[in-house]
């Protein structure tokens, strides 16, 4: 094959090499860009920068070499657009410092950044710290600071991400209320910080207010939805980025669903309680309180992480024509209480008998109407009603 | 795999208490209900009691309801039984033994307890 | 308390044989559960909701039953079947055991 004349050549079927000395300033319109799996570049004294806007349309890139050139910044954004990237090679160019934001996102299994003039500070805590940690092909390299010493012998104590506190109200929060978080921030070279509220969708009525170092957040006329979300302070130094996540407890009454039985390895007759603070429950038989064993229980389902409601089942390992009835859920909190009923029929009696006859169950007497109201207790029986925390 | 290991034999005096664990693993301990069952000498099972280690419930064998307290550390998966005012009838093997939806699916090796003065 | 009877309490049979164990309920419990235990060892579930077999039990055990009567039978008795047989109730509390049949070689 000919030689090929121009600042930069095909390398197989999908990489470029770029070595003609002073042929490139800039990566702007590579040819075959949006395939390009590899990129050697070399001897380019003129290509000082590294942009967002170079690496556009090089989302293939995986393998990523600029050697012996003039390279002296690279943006923490450089690298947005090509997510793929494995391999970065910057060895020998003029770089005094790499941010963290740089390699963040990326999976990096190479990071070569040796013979470039490094200026050992903070900002390069983490490079240290990668090459504590065996990261990237890093320890190997060895990494000078220009004039310092070892990059592994910079001193770091002083070298923290900010720390952040978030107050929350101490005080029950109720539907409607209006809440205010304040989000203190403390640390060397603060650079930027904010909320995340990606979570609260409906939730609130948020307005942000105050900056470095004390950020303010109202959640006004707040729903009962805020319960189980993460609220997010977050904020960035040289070092690195610290988040916190709050969640504020939104109080509200009990609430209860009962569903029809279902065969489900035995029997389950499925609920879903609500409330805030956690409802504790309790079933009824027949209007008795039923008392759990491991043949007749409540059975919780796994809880979604950002939600109060909780699923469940009371499990009937094995029911017959004695389980057969009127069966209450119960739940109560101290902003209320609620009740649901259902009937269930597992079995058809298989003995003939008088319905007037009394059939032996062991079940206690409770003092309650089935649709509401808190179930007596009575002093002399033998206290046996389950409660469950839902939480 | 599901695995029950129970405690090694206790040698008590009379009127004295033992307490006896049964650490679980290979499955998940909150999930399954606890019992505890004794066999005397040359005797049949005796069921002594329960306990759902999810939330705490416990049912007892009314014979044994004054002396036998049924606890869990759901930290450490294990569950225990202990039993008061032992007398020499309580000489026995104790087992713990797991269920969910099927009765007592898996049992301990058993925990050799002998009352003598 | 449900109160199970076992019977026979003890039998000698021949490998090959026929058996049957029957247990008897004091009142009507919804399914019947059976262990099989051998000397100086754990019970080990062997029969549940009357007629399931447990992991791993050879076809040449069943079990059958409701309401207040209930059987295991193993068609053809092997020499590693000779054990001590235990039904269980799981309807009502306390769970009761019965007494237990000792299956002997003749």
């Known amino acids: 094959a000919a030689p090929c004349p121009d600042a930069c050549c095909p390398h197989g079927s999908s990489g470029l090499r770029c070595t003609r000395d002073g042929a490139l300033d800039s990566l702007h319109h590579l040819p075959g860009a949006e395939n390009l799996t590899e990129l050697y570049i070399e001897n380019q004294q003129h290509l000082q920068h590294l942009e967002l806007r170079d690496l556009r349309g090089l989302g293939e890139l995986r393998n990523l070499t600029i050697v012996k050139s003039g390279l002296r910044f690279v943006a923490p954004d450089a690298f947005h657009f090509t997510p793929r990237l494995s391999r970065l090679n910057l060895s020998f160019n003029a770089l005094e410092s790499l941010s963290w934001k740089t390699v963040q996102g990326l999976s990096l299994q190479e990071l070569v950044l040796s013979g470039n003039p490094l200026h050992c500070s903070c900002a390069l805590r983490w490079l240290q710290r990668w090459e504590e940690e065996g990261l990237g092909g890093v320890p190997e390299q060895k990494l000078q600071c220009h004039g310092q010493g070892p990059l592994a012998h910079m001193p770091n104590a002083s070298c923290g991400v900010p720390t952040l506190k978030v107050q929350v109200p101490n005080a029950s929060v109720d539907v409607g209320d209006d809440v205010l978080l304040r989000c203190q921030v403390e640390g060397r070279g603060l650079e930027q910080a904010g909320w995340i509220l990606t979570e609260l969708e409906q939730s609130a009525t948020v307005m942000k207010s105050g900056g470095l170092p004390s950020l303010g957040l109202t959640l006004a006329n707040v729903t009962s939805d805020l319960n189980r979300k993460n609220v997010t302070c977050w904020a960035e130094n040289d070092v690195g980025r610290a988040e916190v996540s709050v969640q504020v407890n939104v109080s509200f009454p009990a609430s209860v669903q009962l569903h029809t039985a279902v065969e489900m390895h035995h029997w389950c007759i499925p609920f879903s309680v609500d409330g805030q603070p956690a409802p504790s429950l309790r079933w009824l038989f027949n209007g008795s309180v039923l008392n759990e064993t491991s043949f007749i229980f409540t059975e919780f389902l796994e809880p979604a992480a950002n939600e109060t409601v909780r699923h469940g089942c009371l499990r009937l390992n094995q029911p017959t024509h004695v389980n057969n009835g009127n069966y209450t859920l119960l739940a109560a909190n101290p902003f209320g209480q609620a009740s649901a009923s259902i009937m269930a029929a597992f079995m058809d009696n298989p003995f003939e008998f008088n319905p007037e006859d009394p059939i032996p169950v062991s079940f206690s007497p409770v003092d309650t109407n089935s649709t509401s109201g808190d179930p007596v207790e009575k002093k002399d029986e033998t206290p046996f009603g389950v409660s469950v925390a839902v939480g | 795999q599901v695995q029950l290991v129970q405690s090694g034999a206790e040698v008590k005096k009379p009127g004295a208490s033992v307490k006896v664990s049964c650490k679980s693993s290979?499955?998940?301990?909150?999930?399954?209900?606890m019992h505890w069952v004794r066999q005397a000498p040359g005797q049949g099972l005796e069921w002594i009691g329960e306990i759902y280690p999810n939330n705490g419930r416990v049912n007892y064998n009314e014979k044994f309801k004054n002396r036998a307290t049924l606890t869990v550390d759901i930290s450490i998966s294990t569950a225990y039984m202990e039993l008061s005012r032992l007398r020499s009838d309580d000489t026995a093997v104790y087992y713990c033994a797991r269920s969910r939806y099927d009765p007592m699916e898996d049992w301990g090796q058993g925990t050799t307890v002998t009352v003598s003065s | 308390d449900v109160q199970l009877t076992q019977s026979p309490s003890s039998l000698s049979a021949s490998v090959g044989d026929r058996v049957t164990i029957t247990c008897s309920a004091s009142s009507s419990v919804g399914y019947m559960h059976w262990y099989q235990q051998k000397p100086g060892k754990a019970p080990k579930r062997w029969i549940y909701?009357?007629?399931k077999l447990a992991s791993g039990v050879p076809s040449r055990f069943s079990g059958s039953g409701s309401g207040t009567d209930y059987t295991l039978t193993i068609s053809s008795l092997q020499p590693e079947d000779f054990a001590t047989y235990f039904c269980q109730q799981w309807s009502s509390i306390p769970l009761t055991f019965g007494q237990g049949t000792r299956l002997e070689i003749k």
């Open positions: 909701d009357t007629s």
């Open positions: 290979g499955y998940t301990f909150t999930n399954y209900w």
